[in-house]
Every structure is written in C-alpha cells, then in structure tokens.
C-alpha cells in the first residue's frame, strides 16, 4: 500500500502541475511597428508581435491582428500605449490631441464588437517644446470565453512609440469559469 | 485501504497547499523617501520599504534596490509613480519636464539590462498654478528566471511624491515555465 | 487498490477543482452613473453595478458602496477612472483641475480608513477646446482579511464618465495568505 | 550621444558685442534649465549666467551683470548669450551646460551642478 500510496501521489503531482499549466493562458503582444497606420482617426492595430523580445504566447492564438481566446476564463486584460512626437518628423497637423486607447472583445457566434476598457487623454502638444511624451494604462479582470477575440483601437497611430516597452497589450488566465 | 485513503488526502491538501504557496513569491515595494536622489537627470531608485505599511516580500528577495528573482516562473510585474511639486518646494528649474519611469530587468549572468516597460508623460508645470501632480500606472507579464533582478529608473526623482500609496512597485508569480 | 487509486483521483480532482474555485474571489464593478455626487472635492463614490454588463462579483460582496472582502487573501486591486468634459455641459468652475482616485481599505474591527493607492493628475482645461479627457490608472497588490472594506473616493465626481469601460474598479484573489 | 555646441565667438573691440549660442542635440534638453560658464587662461571656470527652461528666470555672475543676457527662443534651441559693452578681462573660452537639478538651488553658480557641457567657443577682446 506504501508503493501504491508513493505512486497515487506521484503520479498526481504530474497531473496537478500538467494541469494547472494546461490551465493558464497568457499572452504578451508588442507593437510591429513596421507596418503601423497613419492617419489621426481610431484604428484598429492588427500588427503584434507575439515571439520575439518581451512578446510571447501560450494556449491563445494571435491570428488576423486579434488575439483568440482558446480557453473559457476569467482573464486579466492590460495595454500599455506610447505616444510621442519629435519636432525632426515634422509639425503636427493639429496641437490639440485625442490620444486614445480601447481594448475591444468581439464575439464570432454573435458578430458584435464592444469596448471592455478605455483610457487617455486630451492634449496639448505645443510647438513650445521639441519633443511630447505620453503613455495609457488600463488593466480589468474578464470573463472570455473561447473563439472571442480581443483586439486593440487607438487614435493617432502615426505618434505611436514602436518600443516593445512602450506600445502592449495582453492577457493572462486567473481562474476558470464556475 | 479506508485510512490510506484518508491519508493520502490528507498529505495531499498538506502538499498541495504547501506547493502553492511556495509556488506563488510576490513584492510589493513602496518608497523609502529618506533617500531619494536628487536630479533632473534619469537615476535608478534603490531605497524601497519592503516590510513596513502595506509593502511585503514572500519567496522574493530585497537587495542594493533591487527586487531579485528567486523562484523562475511568468510575474505579472507593476509600478505606480507619482510626481508632484508646490510652489513652497521652491522654484522649477524647468516648466517642461518629462515624467517617465522605466522597469528594467538585468541579469547576472549574461550582465546586461533591458526595458520591461516604461511610461510617462512630459509636462508644462507653469508657475501659474501653486500645486501640480501626476501619475504613472504601467503593468505587464513578464518571464523571469532565478537571479534575475527588477529595477525602477525614473526622470526628475526630486519631485516624487514619498506616501506609500502614491509610488510602489510590486510582482506577484502567476505560473510556472513549462 | 487500483479502482482505490481511481477513486482517490477522482475524489481529488473534485475536491481541487472545487478548492480552486473557492479559493478566488473576485470583483469588476462598473459605475452606475444615475448616482453620481456632484461638486468638486474629494467624495467616496457609492453606486457602482455588480452583475450587469462587464460588471461581476463572486465570493466578496458589494454592500453600501463598499466592496467587502469574505475570505482572507493577497489580492490585485485595480480601478480605472475617466474624466471628461464637454463645452455642451456647460462651463467649468475652474480650469484648473485636480482630477485624482483614491483606493482606500476600511477595518471595521479598528474603525479606520486608510489609502492603499492614488493616482491622478492636475490638468488645464482651456476654453480653447471644445473636449477634455483624461483617465487613470492604478494597480496593486495587497493583503486582505475577511470583513475589510475596498471604496474608491474621486476628486471632481460630476466630470466622471459614465460608460462601464472607462469607470470601475476590480480586485481578485491571487493566494492565500501563509 | 549627447551633444552641446557652441558657436558664435570670435576676436572683437573692447566695447563691442557679441552673442553666443548654444544648440543641445542627442536628446532633449532644449527646454532644460542652462548656464553659460568661461574660462580664462590660467584661471579656474567661472560662472556667467543661468536660465530656466521656460526663459522666465535668469540669474548672472556679478562680473557680468548689466552687460550680458541670457534668452531662449520661445520655442526650441538654441539658447542665446548676448554680450555687450565687452572688456579685455572677459577674454575666455565659454561653455554651455546643462542644470542637472529638477529644482533651482542655491548653489545654482557651481560647475558641478551642470553636467553635458560642450567643447566651448573663444572669445577673444582686444584693440
């Protein structure tokens, strides 16, 4: 019974750590800055990184610019977005700004999309200083379930920083869903 | 086989238990205001409470201002900054200032240290205003290994706000590597 | 002892799942904005939806305006908050604004209230512009114990906005206190 | 790389003028806070002149006060020393830098508080 007991909690240990990874997603998705969008109207980012640097992926799916929940959860969502602008690219079409964030989740079954978390500012870049800086944070616990996709909008995206510390977003599972 | 039974389950919730506690090290550092340096220029803050007010360590170690790796696994990793200056302090040397903070990481053996995250914000202080303030949020899910070591850098150190509320940095573990 | 061994899988499984599920409790309150105070000094903000929209709560209770804590645990709190204005809602008082959060726990054994994160910004909300915006963003991680308290206190209420993805606060379970 | 240069000295009468500029490139500094410093031959550096990022607040050397000012483009670089009604004694090499402090204090007229400084330029008076 000793032998059979060692080998009920051995093989346990393997079925509770192979699980409780099985369990948890996450995703880490940095900005591709080769191929960001112009223009100062909201757009949707659909260029990130996923296994290079900081970025990496395990159990979701990054595909067409979404990151695809593969798993029913209750996920933590962040973005960190990094705006800025040097006098050396040039004068600003307008001073006054809208730097935007929206962290958007999008149901296949019922094709409808719709905004969990936003965040930024009004500004002001004036032609007073050389170089502007501004950075949104937001962060909010999810209930996703699997096929939902979440994708990232912003305003202004030409004034993106494309450091893989400055422009994320991602994702990780904290508990399953009752 | 009843009271094997019985016993496995018991060394089981035991072990469990124990491995899960084991398995998630956390921090939560706030500012040690005595010692802050003084500068407009970039430093590395590196006097942080770790026992006092709602800062805390577990499976983690404080050491030279650095929050070091013990357990290797992803963290989710976070800093809150705050700045502020009255007009009592004294008189800016600057209106524009650039607010940053910076979460690097460094490792021993390969000596070098990257980004994680950074964030900010640059700022028109004017003297038409007796108080201002400002703060920086920034989050993300980061591998660490053992060893490795978390820093804080930020710009203009002389205007951070000293209350353990307002500039904190912390991680908390959240999964094992595969 | 095999079908022994079966059923201590399977009565482990159960009792695992089950622990798991009771051991992380969580919250995403969004506001409810048919009851926002108005004035600009620091209130405490009270009505907030639990169980509509993104808003959720599962194992903590939602009492008075006050998100109260059933089970002992480290936990990551986290509230967003935006601000806007509009030159339709009228003119601003001043525009010179302090626009700050503030998360604070309350002991109902020591009858006390302190603040476990702030956030915010003072801003200058011209006429020149027709819009204002600005959010925040705080995140932290911190010991509770059953029956505390989490309420979220605002400077300048009445410039909040309303929409669930730009004003909440949320807090889940991440481990067990040792 | 951080760079300060200056530009615009030169041979010059006693009694005439001449302005100094300094541009910042590498990294932003163009709205921190600057001093103008010289050198004189076989002389320790001595301080000229402070101003704050924005322009509003200026401070001088008590050798200098009345003849020389300092100003910044409201916008970006450089940042300007006009020197007028100058003496043989003002003979130096003059540096730019950068004030390393978030705060003005009152040791504002050091060199150790400044830090990024540039290679100089001579200004030379003479008849």
């Known amino acids: 019974i000793r032998a059979e007991k060692a080998m009920v909690d051995g093989s346990w240990l393997d079925l509770a750590k192979r699980s409780k990874l099985e369990a948890q997603p996450f995703a880490h998705l940095t900005i591709n800055a080769t191929d960001i969008p112009s223009g100062s109207h909201k757009v949707s980012l659909s260029s990130w990184y996923h296994d290079r640097g900081w970025a990496k992926i395990s159990n979701m799916t990054f595909s067409n610019g979404k990151l695809i929940v593969n798993q029913d959860g209750f996920y933590y969502l962040y973005a960190n977005i990094c705006f800025r602008h040097h006098e050396t690219s040039g004068d600003l079409a307008t001073e006054y700004l809208q730097l935007m964030v929206y962290v958007t989740k999008t149901s296949i079954k019922i094709p409808s999309s719709h905004t969990l978390m936003k965040g930024g500012s009004t500004k002001y870049w004036s032609g007073n200083s050389e170089f502007h800086f501004y950075s949104i944070n937001v962060g909010g616990f999810f209930k996703l379930r699997s096929g939902e996709e979440i994708s990232i909008e912003v305003s202004n995206p030409s004034l993106l920083d494309p450091d893989q510390d400055a422009t994320y977003f991602g994702a990780f599972k904290v508990r399953d869903i009752d | 086989i009843r009271a094997e039974k019985a016993m496995v389950d018991g060394s089981w919730l035991d072990l469990a238990k124990r491995s899960k506690l084991e398995a998630q090290p956390f921090a939560h550092l706030t500012i040690n205001a005595t010692d802050i340096p003084s500068g407009s220029h970039k430093v590395s803050l590196s006097s942080w409470y770790h026992d006092r007010g709602w800062a805390k360590i577990s499976n983690m170690t404080f050491s030279n201002g650095k929050l070091i790796v013990n357990q290797d696994g992803f963290y989710y990793l976070y800093a809150n900054i705050c700045f502020r200056h009255h007009e009592t302090s004294g008189d800016l040397a600057t209106e524009y200032l650039q607010l940053m903070v910076y979460v690097t990481k460094t490792s021993i053996k390969i000596p070098s240290s990257h980004t994680l995250m950074k964030g900010g914000s640059t700022k028109y202080w004017s003297g038409n205003s007796e108080f201002h303030f400002y703060s920086i949020n920034v989050g993300g899910f980061f591998k660490l290994r053992s060893g490795e070591e978390i820093s804080i850098e930020v710009s203009n150190p002389s205007l951070l706000d000293p209350d353990q509320d307002a500039t904190y940095f912390g991680a908390f573990k959240v999964r094992d590597i595969d | 002892i095999r079908a022994e061994k079966a059923m201590v899988d399977g009565s482990w499984l159960d009792l695992a799942k089950r622990s798991k599920l009771e051991a992380q409790p969580f919250a995403h309150l969004t506001i409810n904005a048919t009851d926002i105070p108005s004035g600009s000094h620091k209130v405490s903000l009270s009505s907030w939806y639990h169980d509509r929209g993104w808003a959720k709560i599962s194992n903590m209770t939602f009492s008075n305006g006050k998100l109260i804590v059933n089970q002992d645990g480290f936990y990551y709190l986290y509230a967003n908050i935006c601000f806007r204005h509009h030159e339709t809602s009228g003119d601003l008082a001043t525009e010179y604004l302090q626009l700050m959060v503030y998360v604070t726990k309350t002991s109902i054994k020591i009858p006390s209230s302190h603040t476990l994160m702030k956030g915010g910004s003072t801003k200058y909300w011209s006429g020149n512009s027709e819009f204002h915006f600005y959010s925040i963003n705080v995140g932290g991680f911190f010991k509770l114990r059953s029956g505390e308290e989490i309420s979220i206190e605002v400077s300048n209420p009445s410039l909040l906005d309303p929409d669930q993805d730009a004003t909440y606060f949320g807090a889940f379970k991440v481990r067990d206190i040792d | 790389e951080v760079q300060l240069v200056e530009s615009g000295g030169g041979l010059v009468q006693p009694g005439g003028s001449l302005r100094l500029s300094c541009a910042a490139s590498?990294?932003?500094?163009?709205?921190?806070?600057m001093g103008w410093f010289r050198q004189a031959p076989g002389k320790g550096r001595e301080f000229v002149g402070f101003?704050?990022?924005?322009?509003?607040?200026?401070y001088y050397g008590e050798s200098v006060k009345g003849r020389f000012t300092i100003s910044r483009d409201n916008a970006q670089n450089p940042v300007y020393l006009q020197m007028n009604s100058l003496r043989p004694e003002d003979t130096a090499v003059y540096y730019c830098?950068?004030?390393?402090?978030?705060?003005?204090?009152?040791?504002?007229?050091?060199?150790?508080?400044?830090?990024?400084w540039g290679q100089g330029t001579l200004v030379t008076v003479s008849s």
């Open positions: 830098a950068v004030y390393r402090r978030t705060y003005i204090s009152s040791t504002y007229s050091e060199s150790s508080e400044y830090d990024y």
């Open positions: 590498g990294r932003t500094f163009s709205r921190s806070a």
């Open positions: 101003i704050t990022g924005s322009g509003g607040t200026t």
